[in-house]
């Protein structure tokens, strides 16, 4: 039994890191393999992650971690029984994929303005709480070409747009994702989408 593709890990910079790897043949990850991990820290202890299958030869492990700080470094040991298959390390702050924003809501009761709000996925004491920026994706269910991205580069988790920038009388969907420039993170997954019917009064045209 050998490792074909070494484990690569990504952290949510909060409490979970996800590691994926591939074996050289079909493997029952949960019965045959164990991923041991330990924070390099005086007060830490070794933990064991039981991997799950991710395709025939692929394995994935969800590592429960202490709250992340930038200096953290974890040792990783992949075992098959008594055989050490791979040894490595992982710095969560260098491989961050933020959590997806939640609670996306479209407020349509403001005169001719759409207000989209969502929740920051981190608690206030987490470093990423004040460092997230967002991308909001709005698209028409009727017209695949009517697809737009709004970059929200300020900290407030909200976006205001004029209802008139969208077509009236049709349904739209929106979703939001996050990233943090400070750690050069990847984008988060998209939030669940929310749907609304766009309608606004056409301005009275004088002839």
């Amino acid at each position: 039994m050998k490792v074909l593709q070494e484990p690569t890990c990504v952290s949510d910079y909060m409490s979970i890191s996800t590691c994926e790897w591939k074996m050289n043949g079909p493997t029952n990850c949960s019965t045959e393999l164990r991923l041991l991990y330990q924070l390099v820290f005086l007060l830490s202890e070794a933990h064991t992650c039981i991997p799950e299958n991710n395709g025939g030869a692929g394995c994935v492990c969800h590592l429960l971690m202490d709250d992340v700080v930038s200096a953290d470094n974890y040792t990783l040991d992949l075992w098959a029984g008594q055989q050490l298959l791979w040894k490595g390390s992982f710095k969560p702050s260098e491989h961050v994929k933020p959590r997806a924003p939640g609670n996306l809501t479209v407020h349509t009761n403001v005169s001719d303005t759409l207000l989209l709000t969502w929740s920051n996925p981190y608690p206030p004491d987490n470093y990423l709480y004040n460092h997230l920026t967002y991308a909001v994706n709005i698209w028409s269910e009727n017209d695949p070409a009517d697809f737009r991205i709004y970059n929200v580069t300020y900290l407030e988790p909200s976006l205001r747009i004029a209802a008139s920038t969208l077509k009236s009388g049709i349904s739209y969907r929106a979703r939001v994702r996050a990233w943090a420039q400070c750690y050069n993170t990847t984008w988060s997954e998209w939030s669940p989408s929310t749907k609304w019917h766009n309608s606004y009064r056409e301005p009275f045209e004088q002839h």
Partner: antibody, heavy 115, light 109 residues
Amino acid sequence: EVQLVESGGGLVQPGGSLRLSCAASGFTFSRNAMFWVRQAPGKGLEWVSGIGTGGATSYADSVKGRFTISRDNAKNSLYLQMNSLRAEDTAVYYCARGRYYFDYWGQGTLVTVSS
Amino acid sequence: EIVLTQSPGTLSLSPGERATLSCRASQSVSSSYLAWYQQKPGQAPRLLIFGASSRAPGIPDRFSGSGSGTDFTLTISRLEPEDFAVYYCQQYDHSAGWTFGQGTKVEIK
């Protein structure tokens, strides 16, 4: 908002015992290492003890064998059992959250060891 | 055990002046594990700098940290009245644990 509130300080005779408590709120207590740091009157800061999320502990040489740190994650509480107290243990005892450094501190509780 | 020595013991300066505080370690310290704190009378210490040069949340940018190996510096570019306090450096070592310097008092001249 992160809050750490110490209690249990007071006047105790040399050789006596005292148990300090620290109530934590505003963060996930179970995912953070916790510490006690003390400051003798007019002196500098001294790390006393720390406890990891899994219960691993460490102590300064000056308190080893006399002090015991513990935590109760269900109660979001940190404790310091201090036995065989000496005059030189007189200090303000701070509860702190952290790891390689201490990012949040309580306001401290004064322990006075005197006859 | 790593010993941290801070200098000077007391720094007498006027508001608006630049303050430079030194912290010297008895052996090499990882920059990732060097921090600075501010303490005012009757108050708990407050984290200013971690990782030798990263400002803690809410800390004004007049505070900056630098250095590596055995020599580290905290600089306050322009002293404000609220900056007069005692400053401590602190290091972490995987075997020896956590140690503080003896502190530098920044007082009004």
